[in-house]
Amino acid sequence: MKVLQEPTCVSDYISLSTCEWKMGGPTNCSAELRLVYQLVFLISETNMCVPENNGAAGCVCHLFMEDMVGADNYTLDLWAGQQLLWKGSFKPSEHVKPKAPENLTVYTNVSETLLLTWSNPYPPDNYLYEKLTYAVNIWNENDPTDSRIYDVTYQEPTLRIAASTLKSGVSYRARVRAWAQSYNSTWSEWSPSTKWYNAYKEPFEKH
């Protein structure tokens, strides 16, 4: 039994890190493998993760890590029974993938403006709370080519767009994701999408 693709890990920088790897052949990850991890600053505590399958040869492990701080570094040991398959380390602050924004809502009754709001997924005392910026994806449900991305480079979790910039009488969907530039993070997953009907009518022009 051997590791084909070494574990790579990302952290939500609040309580959870996720590591994924590929084995050399079909593997029952939960029955055959264990990922042992220790906080270097508190190596008296040995934590063990039971991986799940992610495809026939792929494994994924969800590592619970409380009270993360920037200096935290973890040792990782991947075991198959008594056989050590791989050793590595992981510094959560250097591999951040934020949690997805939550509670995306579209308000269509604000004059001729669409107001989109969502929730920052972090509590105010978390380091990422004031570091997130966002991207909002809006698309026409019936026309995949009618899709656009709005970069929200300010921290307020809102976006206002003119209803007139979208086609009238069409159902649209929106979703939002986040990233933390100062942590050199990757983008979060997209939030669940929300749907609305763009009922905006162009005003009649007088000739």
Epitope: V36, L39, V40, F41, L42, S44
Partner: antibody, heavy 117, light 110 residues
């Protein structure tokens, strides 16, 4: 039976060196964190140092530079190398396995180190 | 340096007495609960009684209990038995691999 057995203690002159051993049975040192703890005669317990399952080591501030923890996986044995010994290092030295929530869950019987001229 | 201060340093009690020992840390222990208690008899190795501030270790009689959080912790023996006469130590765990012990509390027969 799960147990830890220390050995290697004895009389050593100031400035000398000594290596203590802790043989483990019933547990695999590769998957456990282990510490050394000492107790001077008639005194309290004092943590010396630790080795994690990954092999990472750390020490009490006073032990850094003089004491070194290692392990031999093939012998399932933990070691404490002590150099530049002083009279105040005279103590019973225990090895201990860490259990839940950083506790010292399992202790050896201890080995006495006497530093004297 | 982080200090763990136990009180009292010694106490005299009778069989059947309720005994309380306190441990005060100079800083909050890791996760506010990484505090353990140990019993040591003369010439013997320490034995784990309580871990995570209040969890009773396997094989330890139910008359032993622990409580507290952060910096202030208590070990209680609800009804002292002859075999409980010993020295008791608290120990904390801290980020940075710091594991200080209290100075000990000797429980003697009155």
């Amino acid at each position: 039976e799960v147990q830890l057995v220390e050995s290697g203690g004895g009389l050593v002159q100031p400035g000398g060196s000594l290596r203590l051993s802790c043989a483990a049975s019933g547990i695999d040192l590769r998957t456990n964190s282990m510490s050394w703890v000492r107790q001077a005669p008639g005194k309290g317990l004092e943590w010396v140092g630790i080795i994690g399952s990954s092999g990472y080591m750390d020490y009490a501030s006073w032990a850094k530079g003089r004491f070194t923890i290692s392990r031999d996986n093939s012998k399932n044995t933990l070691y404490l190398q002590m150099n530049s010994l002083r009279a105040e290092d005279t103590a019973v030295y225990y090895c201990a396995r860490h259990g839940d929530s950083s506790s010292f869950a399992l202790w050896g019987q201890g080995t006495l180190v006497t530093v004297s001229s | 340096d982080i200090q763990m201060t136990q009180s009292p340093s010694s106490l005299s009690a009778s069989v059947g007495d309720r005994v309380t020992i306190t441990c005060r840390a100079s800083e909050s222990v890791y996760k506010n609960n990484r505090l353990s208690w140990y019993q040591q008899k003369p010439g013997k190795a320490p034995k784990l009684l309580i871990y995570e501030a209040s969890k009773v270790a396997s094989g330890v009689p139910s008359r032993f209990s622990g409580s507290g959080s952060g910096t202030d912790f208590t070990l209680t023996i609800s009804s002292l038995q002859p075999e409980d006469f010993a020295t008791y130590y608290c120990a904390g765990a801290y980020r940075g691999n710091i594991y200080p012990f209290g100075q000990g509390t000797k429980v003697e027969i009155k």
